[in-house]
């Protein structure tokens, strides 16, 4: 990128230069017309015939740097061949010298600085690559001469620029001061400012664009060479801050539309805004859950939002005495999750009435809560209790929700409690016919034994039709008519207002073989 | 020698139309830009018109009071400017000079700003 | 457009130094040049480019520009010097001319 200081071809006004010294002679500056009819002003000069040693200086205005380390100067200037002026003498040149002189200010006068090199810094003595001819009373012919000269290292507030010309016979058609920088450049989503080239190459730093942060790594930076190009392209940069998207060549960043999002700085475009979400905004990074939808907190912020599920269905229970069985299957709405688990909430109610959440003296198996397989076995339940279960779904989300948590309700009530098993048969007597047995009364939890039943076989007649039934409001019974010296297997069971407990171990009893043997206990 | 002659200038009634002439010796006409000069009776000097040097593209230019109503012209191959004077007021009523612009040493393109070469006038009366 | 204005007349005696000025805005930015016009004869460039003498001019004519003044200087004033005096310079538009109304020089 030029950035002009100075350019003939566009002052409007007369341009005034200083010249040296005042005499015939010397440079003046004439006006015309470029091709668009816009004005114009050249420097002519022409003293073929001038003293050995006398030099037409010509002076620009100041002008100044403007940061400028190193300046430009385009000339565009014709030269006539000495060949064709038919007054020029040994002296006639096809050259002339260019010079700068740096000053903080506008300081020069007709007369300072001392018009020759030191002060003055010489650029370059300037030859025509092309000289014009001129036969008399015919147009001169001839191309127009452009030479770009380079002035620096320059470091005050501004310089003058100065021609010299020594027996030339030229024009000065135009004077371009220039300097070049590197332009304003965003590149990766970096902007790199407008810069001024000080050296060879300028490390410049980058900045991100509006709505960018910093990629990891390095900041970057661009090199700014001394011909106003930048050198290659940055390795890191900037990337789009969540909500907004590279857009236009990666030179800026564009905010989500509305019903989408991007939650994540970095490279990729905005994404519709997942299941069961919106987003109302431009530049979302997270698109809102709709009501009744969450995220759970571990999940990834563009993950669709999700609903506690439904209650589980179909709840199977088997009570097995004092265990309970309970199996159920799946809710029909799983809330759109992986992560389901179920919970059991759990009332007992009392025979008189009274109810009251579950003891501690329940256990529940794998657990009560963090299920993952639809069934538990509860054990430890009372007899003749009312228990009321409550079966809940349970998903990632379900501690976001408000309202109550949707449960399949089942009811189970236990059985009254039955006196237990009978054991500790003894025969008291035995005779051929007879077995006299007596036994401990059990303890009944539910009240007191009001009898006893008692079954019995002869050992090997295993049919039904040979078991044999007495009842008996004592704990004893006397078996009669019995075989002589047979085996007889005999079972006790007792009854309470529960119902009857269950028949105790068989005990094994012997009758007599003759009665000479007379009666006589047994222990059991 | 090097010189300007006008003529062409007389009594002309309001409305009426004149052509003046300005003969050019001793220098190369067609580099030269020539201009029109007026001064009206005891006034001071008002310029007229303009017109470039052949190469220049021959552009011509006119002072507001006169433009639409004059026009410059030229004629390399006889050397003599032109000023055609259509519409005539008597505010138009003045000594004419044929003057030359500074001339450049051989880029007829470009010109000095001032005149360095004058005719001695030609008297235009616009009377009715 | 700018506009020159000149006094109308200056008067000075022989020998002594005649200043004629020329006034606009800025005119030091321009070019002026200077005409001498005697009665009954066509004007005569005496200063250019402000300050520069055209070849066969007396060196008593001088000229400087600055400001928004310019000024024409008869040094040592000659009975021969007393004419009208028109300043001129280049508009902005480079293809106009204008004059100052004239400043009327006499020698007494």
């Known amino acids: 990128l030029e950035e002009t200081l100075l350019n003939t071809k566009l002052e409007t006004a007369d341009l005034k230069w200083v010249t040296f010294p005042q005499v015939d002679g010397q440079w003046e500056e004439l006006s015309g017309l470029d091709e668009e009819q816009h004005s114009v002003r050249t420097y002519e000069v022409c003293d073929v015939q001038r003293a050995p040693g006398q030099a037409h200086w010509l002076r620009t205005g100041w002008v100044p740097r403007r940061g400028a380390v190193h300046v430009y100067a385009t000339l565009r200037f014709t030269m006539l061949e000495c060949l064709s002026l038919p007054r020029a003498g040994r002296s006639c040149k096809e050259t002339f010298t260019v010079f700068y002189y740096e000053s903080d200010a506008d300081t020069a006068t007709a007369l300072t600085p001392a018009w020759m090199e030191n002060p003055y810094i010489k650029v370059d003595t300037v030859a025509a690559e092309h000289l014009t001819r001129k036969r008399p009373g015919a147009e001169a012919t001839g191309k127009v001469n452009v030479k770009t000269l380079r002035l620096g290292p320059l470091s005050k507030a501004g310089f003058y620029l100065a021609f010299q010309d020594q027996g030339a016979c030229m024009a000065l058609l135009s004077l371009h001061l220039f300097y070049k920088k590197c332009a304003q450049l965003t590149v990766n989503l970096t902007r790199f400012p407008e810069t001024v080239p000080r050296e060879l190459v300028v490390p410049v730093a980058g900045s991100c664009v509006v709505d960018a942060v910093p990629a990891p790594g390095p900041s970057p930076s661009l090199y700014c060479r001394e011909d106003g190009q930048w050198a290659e392209q940055p390795v890191t940069g900037c990337s789009c801050a969540p909500g907004f998207e590279a857009a236009e060549g990666n030179t800026k960043c564009r905010a989500c539309a509305q019903g989408t999002f991007k939650p994540l700085s970095g490279e990729g475009s905005c994404q519709p805004c997942p299941a069961n979400s919106h987003s109302n905004t431009i530049g979302s990074a997270v698109c809102q859950c709709r009501v009744g939808y969450f995220r759970a907190r571990t999940d990834p912020r563009g993950a669709p939002c999700t609903t506690p599920p439904s209650a589980p269905r179909s709840v199977v229970s088997r009570l097995n005495g004092s265990s309970l069985h309970l199996e159920w299957s799946a809710p029909l709405e799983s809330g759109g999750r992986e992560d389901l688990t179920y919970a059991l909430r759990c009332r007992e109610c009392r025979p008189g009435g009274s109810c009251a959440p579950c003891g501690g003296d329940l256990t529940f198996d794998p657990g009560p809560r963090d299920l993952v397989e639809p069934w538990v076995v509860v054990r430890g339940l009372r007899p003749d209790f009312t228990y009321t279960f409550e079966v809940t779904a349970l998903n990632g989300v379900s501690s976001l929700a408000t309202g109550p948590v949707p449960f399949e309700p089942v009811n189970v009530t236990t059985d009254r409690e039955v006196p237990p098993a009978v054991s500790d048969i003894r025969v008291t007597r035995s005779s051929p016919s007879s077995l006299s047995l007596a036994w401990a009364v059990p303890r009944a939890p539910s009240g007191a034994v009001l009898d006893y039943e008692v079954k019995y076989h002869e050992k090997g007649a295993e049919g039904p039709s040979s078991v044999r039934f007495l009842k008996t409001s004592e704990n004893r019974a006397e078996l009669r008519g019995l075989k002589r010296g047979a085996s007889y297997l005999v079972q006790v069971r007792a009854r309470s207002e529960a119902g009857y407990g269950p028949f105790g171990q068989e005990h094994h009893s012997q009758t007599q073989l003759d009665e000479s043997e007379g009666w006589r206990e047994q222990l059991a | 020698q090097v010189q300007l002659v006008e003529s062409g200038g007389g009594l002309v009634q309001p409305g009426g139309s004149l052509r003046l002439s300005c003969a050019a010796s001793g220098f190369t006409f067609n580099n030269a830009w020539m201009s029109w000069v007026r001064q009206a009776p005891g006034k001071g000097l008002e310029w007229v018109s303009l017109i470039e040097a052949k190469e220049a593209n021959g552009a011509t230019s006119y002072a507001a009071g006169v433009k639409g109503r004059f026009t410059i012209s030229r004629d390399n191959s006889k050397n003599t400017l032109y000023l055609q004077m259509n519409s005539l007021r008597a505010e138009d009523t003045a000594v004419y000079y044929c003057a030359r612009k500074g001339m450049s040493f051989y880029n007829n393109k470009y010109a000095k700003s001032m005149f360095d070469l004058w005719g001695q006038g030609t008297l235009v009366t616009v009377s009715s | 457009d700018i506009e020159l204005t000149q006094p109308p007349s200056v008067s000075v005696a022989p020998g002594q130094t005649a200043r004629i000025s020329c006034s606009g805005d800025n005119l030091g930015k321009k070019y002026v040049h200077w005409y001498q016009q005697k009665p009954g004869q066509a004007p005569v460039l005496v200063i250019y480019y402000d300050s520069k003498r055209p070849s066969g001019i007396p060196e008593r004519f001088s000229g400087s520009n600055s400001g928004n003044t310019a000024t024409l200087t008869i040094s040592g004033t000659q009975a021969e010097d007393e004419a009208d005096y028109y300043c001129?310079?280049?508009?902005?538009?480079?293809?106009?001319?204008?004059f100052g109304g004239g400043t009327k020089l006499t020698v007494l």
């Open positions: 001129s310079a280049w508009t902005t538009t480079m293809m106009h001319i204008v």
